[in-house]
Interface confidence: low
């Protein structure tokens, strides 16, 4: 069951998922000048059995002009290992969620993918909040939100996070502070349905998110 609306907006905060529940869809979007190959997958789908989850389908982009430069990247073990270091551990999350049954890791990038990753979350998905750069967590209960089904309707639980002040960036629990931050993160923009997340992947992954559908920018 897809979540009908977006996770709650917290002023001066962004969110991200650390792993994706089975049933989550990721649109196969290509950057400008490229498009999905004809008959290519429209989306990747997190599927699996009781012991293993993975993304079904593979996104492939080809040049809009030549239409014959189809390439696809399958991550090498080293790349996969490197990506694993960007997943954050949390006191509120004793188990690495990405290794939990029924969850998929962040899919590796594919060649010429769009700067925006659009995810479609399902009931049971958890997202984690952090204060944007220049703000710190003044009060923290659980800084997370879960998409739940109640009386036949989906809703997101309210995270207990207040971000305040012009101080050092609050990181996700257990996440090291990046060596250098490019520029201040903008506040989340409200979008009725799609919300996006802007990831700048440096040594660590600093996150900027907006709502229930997610964007990732690879530099």
């Amino acid at each position: 069951e897809l979540c009908d609306d977006d996770p709650p907006e917290i002023p001066h905060a962004t969110f991200k998922a650390m792993a994706y529940k089975e049933g989550t869809m990721l649109n196969c979007e290509c950057k400008r000048g490229f498009r999905r190959i004809k008959s290519g997958s429209l989306y990747m789908l997190c599927t699996g059995n009781s012991s293993h989850s993975s993304w079904d389908n593979q996104c492939q982009c080809t040049s809009s002009a030549t239409r014959n430069t189809t390439k696809q990247v399958t991550p090498q073990p080293e790349e996969q290992k490197e990506r694993k270091t960007t997943e954050m551990q949390s006191p509120m999350q004793p188990v690495d969620q990405a290794s939990l049954p029924g969850h998929c890791r962040e899919p590796p990038p594919w060649e010429n993918e769009a700067t925006e990753r659009i995810y479609h979350f399902v009931v049971g998905q958890m997202v984690y909040y952090q204060c944007v750069q220049g703000y710190r967590a003044l009060h923290r209960g659980p800084a997370e939100s879960v998409c739940k089904m109640t009386h036949g309707k989906t809703r997101w639980t309210q995270p207990q996070l207040i971000c305040t002040g012009e101080m050092e960036t609050s990181q996700f629990p257990g996440e090291e502070k990046p060596q250098a931050s490019p520029e201040g993160r903008p506040e989340s923009e409200t979008s009725c349905l799609v919300t996006t997340t802007d990831f700048q992947i440096q040594t660590e992954m600093a996150a900027t998110m907006e709502t229930s559908i997610f964007t990732t920018e690879y530099q």
């Epitope: 649109n27 498009r35 429209l42 009725c192 709502t211």
Partner: nanobody
Framework: QVQLQESGGGLVQAGGSLRLSCAAS????????MGWFRRAPGKEREFVAA????????LYADSVKGRSTISRDNGGNMVFLQMNSLKPEDTAVYYC????????????????????WGQGTQVTVSS
Amino acid sequence: QVQLQESGGGLVQAGGSLRLSCAASGRTFRTHNMGWFRRAPGKEREFVAAISWNIDNKLYADSVKGRSTISRDNGGNMVFLQMNSLKPEDTAVYYCAADKIPLSSDVAATATEYDDWGQGTQVTVSS
């Protein structure tokens, strides 16, 4: 589900132009193909134009091809139909509709493929 509300209709002289807008609410809008249909007095509902969720594909009825342009703004949750060189036979109530199936690669021209509909906006072309 996607809630839809059309606007932009009105009375226009033959040869004139109109831009119809369809405002959508509901976060699934981004992933659904969208279409415009019309119903003239005493006639069946007729397909006008459709656009895919990712704006890759557009489809037009022969009756409006070359005179109309469908577009969408996913950020603003809007679908548009720009109609030029209007003719009296374009007089109808115009409806915006959302495809049943998200992320569909096929842009449908049949009304049965759409399950969310707006209330419609009246377009009257005088000769």
